[in-house]
């Protein structure tokens, strides 16, 4: 029986050109996480696997950073990044848990800023 629940950041907004942290939290289960997939609509952004580490989709390789923890940081945001994002937790023995986040990328400066990441 799947007892766990996924808590997400819900609906979030960020400024064009800025960055944002996408985070999900799995709770109320003792199941072990084996892998977390991050997807944008039907497109894979990243996979975090216990043994293989992080795989970042080639189309996002220069503007996606792992973390914090199992979260994902999106950088250099464009209006095209607006949309639904999903965290998919693969666990044993429970199975799969999915969380949803809606990101809106705004032109104005009223949106919240993301993390302090640097790309050399």
């Amino acid at each position: 029986m799947m007892t766990g629940t996924i808590e997400t950041t819900g609906n979030i907004s960020a400024e064009k050109g800025g960055s944002i942290i996408l985070q999900c939290h799995l709770s109320s289960t003792t199941a072990q996480v084996t892998q977390v997939n991050w997807e944008q609509q039907d497109q894979l952004l990243a996979i975090c696997n216990a043994d293989l580490g992080w795989h970042i989709s080639p189309s996002f390789k220069d503007r996606v950073a792992p973390g914090p923890g199992l979260g994902l940081t999106l950088q250099s945001l464009t209006v095209n990044d607006t949309g639904e994002y999903f965290c998919i937790y693969h666990t044993y023995p429970d199975g799969t848990y999915t969380g949803r986040i809606f990101l809106e990328v705004l032109e104005s400066s009223v949106a919240e800023h993301g993390a302090r990441f640097q790309i050399p």
Epitope: C48, H55, D62, P66, Q118, I119
Partner: antibody
């Protein structure tokens, strides 16, 4: 098996710089976030920052942003940390650690840095 | 930054005793908390991840509980090899921080 082999102890003069290494083996280095942690003698642990070798993206604890520079070399599976403008308070053991699903599952043996005139 | 407060600073116990170590976060970190053990002149070792999840190779006498702001590491029937320092760490957001540690010593 997973191993993190850190470089040997360093005795350095105040004001100078030091660059230490953390050579990884037994796992795909480029795909794992590598962290650095400071521990002064008899004290607790302080997170310095991390690097994702795949795209060289770094994240620093604000406290160490000027002090530390993190780099990596995928070809040799090695993470590096350079500390600049060294002072007595930089004397410490510095650990590298590999993240696994958000936890620091593997640690190097530590590099002791002693700053003394 | 999130502050993790560990208590007590030192815990003196006799082998065979069962003990509880506390870690309190300055804000809600959900279950994003790990526990590490560090023996003298050794590197830290991961004991418990995400507040309560066990780690392969770690004896079953170690267990963790809590979420939000209050967390506990329990050791059921302490053995001599368990003496040393214990640190909690959060990974809820940047920067990650550690607690100041609890020293488990022989009475």
């Amino acid at each position: 098996q997973v191993q993190l082999q850190q470089s040997g102890p360093e005795l350095v003069k105040p004001g100078s710089s030091v660059k230490m290494s953390c050579k990884a083996s037994g796992f795909p280095f480029a795909n794992h976030v590598m962290h650095w942690v400071k521990q002064q003698p008899g004290q607790g642990l302080e997170w310095i920052g991390c690097i994702f070798p795949f795209n060289e993206i770094t994240n620093y604890n604000e406290k160490f942003k000027v002090k530390a520079t993190l780099t990596s070399d995928k070809s040799s599976s090695t993470a590096y940390m350079e500390l600049s403008s060294l002072a007595s308070e930089d004397s410490a053991v510095y650990y590298c650690a590999r993240e696994q699903l958000g936890s620091f599952a593997y640690w190097g043996q530590g590099t002791l840095v002693t700053v003394s005139a | 930054d999130i502050v993790l407060t560990q208590s007590p600073a030192t815990l003196s116990v006799t082998p065979g005793d069962s003990v509880s170590l506390s870690c309190r976060a300055s804000q809600n970190i959900r279950s994003n908390l790990h526990w590490y053990q560090q023996k003298s002149h050794e590197s830290p070792r991961l004991l418990i991840k995400y507040a309560s999840q066990s780690i392969s190779g770690i004896p079953s006498r170690f267990s963790g509980s809590g979420s939000g702001t209050d967390f506990t590491l329990s050791i059921n029937s302490v053995e001599t090899e368990d003496f040393g320092m214990y640190f909690c760490q959060h990974i809820n957001n940047w920067p990650f921080t550690f607690g100041s540690g609890t020293k488990l010593e022989i009475k």
